[in-house]
Interface confidence: low
Amino acid sequence: LQDLCSNCPAGTFCDNNRSQICSPCPPNSFSSAGGQRTCDICRQCKGVFKTRKECSSTSNAECDCISGYHCLGAECSMCEQDCKQGQELTKKGCKDCCFGTFNDQKRGICRPWTNCSLDGKSVLVNGTKERDVVCGPSPADLSPGASSATPPAPAREPGHSPQIIFFLALTSTVVLFLLFFLVLRFSVVKRSRKKLLYIFKQPFMRPVQTTQEEDGCSCRFPEEEEGGCEL
């Protein structure tokens, strides 16, 4: 006997018990593929979620996060609280980035400043909580005849030879590197992983009506202790 259910299009379900009739999905449900034997319940965007795309008979609703939160996970399965630039989200809320780290976004964790000396470069612009350092030219770029894509070095004062400039640049780079290393070595930067505000897709809601009776949410926090920024 031919399986007539395979002829049922998306947006319907195949009712085996009624001579395999293709019936439309009930309200607040969908089937995204043909031949389904039942329709899936629609996702409801409640709580910290807002609707980006309404549910239709052939596709599930799509959610975004309300203002002050951003999406995480596949299909925006969770919402995480926004912080300001220069901050990261910890167990205790938004905290300023520790010295030597920065975050230029409203999400994510503080990242260490770039270590210019690892590339043989010098620090042209100091880093802040919101911005990474800007690396300047390497000492080799300061010697005559060298070509570089980095910004040109400031005009030299008359009377100073390239050798002296090279020596000063090298010394300052080493000193900066040592300072940077010491700061990182002795600062206690225990960065918490993200505090995720998990909002599960739907607790119990109406399969037939479009309103939801209650929101289900679960807040899970990292177990590790919160670190400070003391030196």
Epitope: N17, T38, D40, M205, P207, V208
Partner: antibody, heavy 117, light 107 residues
């Protein structure tokens, strides 16, 4: 022929977690939902929760904090986990296939769970 | 949650009798109601879905009616194999809830 078969531990101690599996044969979990129902001795049926073809779940609001329903489509198995058991959770546990406009057209035979120390 | 109330909780009837079981919902559920039969050995079977649609393989002596909040399961001529407990179940709103059951015996 579609069949659902529950398998569970039988006896569980209070405060422990119950784990029951429903094995489905002759039917695809990507086309049908599976609902869990329990029946305490001498009492009526109580719906626990459902897992839909797409994998999303709904739980009985009174038990939501203790329940987890998941599935493995490749093994045709649906599992129910219930934590923090008490004597009140002693019951016959059934799984049933959800089809059409959400009726349970095929039921398992049920598995008896006794919560006792 | 929607409360489902069945009456009577038990009844005894003679073979060939017409039997009716009532089910009442605490709020309107349109026609989103199913009926199930649980035999003494614990086996559960679907009888009727969407208030009045007979499930495949169910004898025609079973029928269902009603709408909104009041529903009825009718057995037109009671047979020995009908000894069981009957449950109504709404699916208008999750959580899907069952009535308390009606135990049917033969006199």
């Amino acid at each position: 022929q579609v069949q659902l078969q529950e398998s569970g531990p039988g006896l569980v101690k209070p405060s422990e977690t119950l784990s029951i599996t429903c094995t489905v044969s002759g039917s695809s979990l990507t086309s049908y939902g599976v609902h869990w129902v329990r029946q305490p001795p001498g009492k009526g049926l109580e719906g626990l929760g459902v897992i839909w073809p797409g994998g999303s779940t709904n739980y009985n609001s009174a038990l939501m904090s203790r329940l987890t329903i998941s599935k493995d489509n490749s093994k045709s198995q649906v599992s129910l986990k219930m934590s923090s058991l008490t004597a009140a959770d002693t019951a016959m546990y059934y799984c049933a296939r959800v089809t059409g406009t959400w009726y349970f057209d095929v039921w398992g035979q049920g598995t008896t769970v006794t919560v006792s120390s | 949650d929607i409360q489902m109330t069945q009456s009577p909780s038990s009844l005894s009837a003679s073979l060939g009798d017409r039997v009716t079981i009532s089910c009442s919902a605490s709020q309107g559920i349109s026609n989103y109601l199913n009926w199930y039969q649980q035999k003494p050995d614990g086996t559960v079977k679907l009888l009727i879905y969407y208030t009045s649609t007979l499930h495949s393989g169910v004898p025609s002596r079973f029928s269902g009616s009603g709408s909104g909040t009041d529903f009825t399961l009718t057995i037109s001529s009671l047979q020995p194999e009908d000894v069981a407990t009957y449950y109504c179940q709404q699916y208008s709103k999750l959580p899907w809830t069952f009535g308390g059951g009606t135990k049917l015996e033969i006199k």
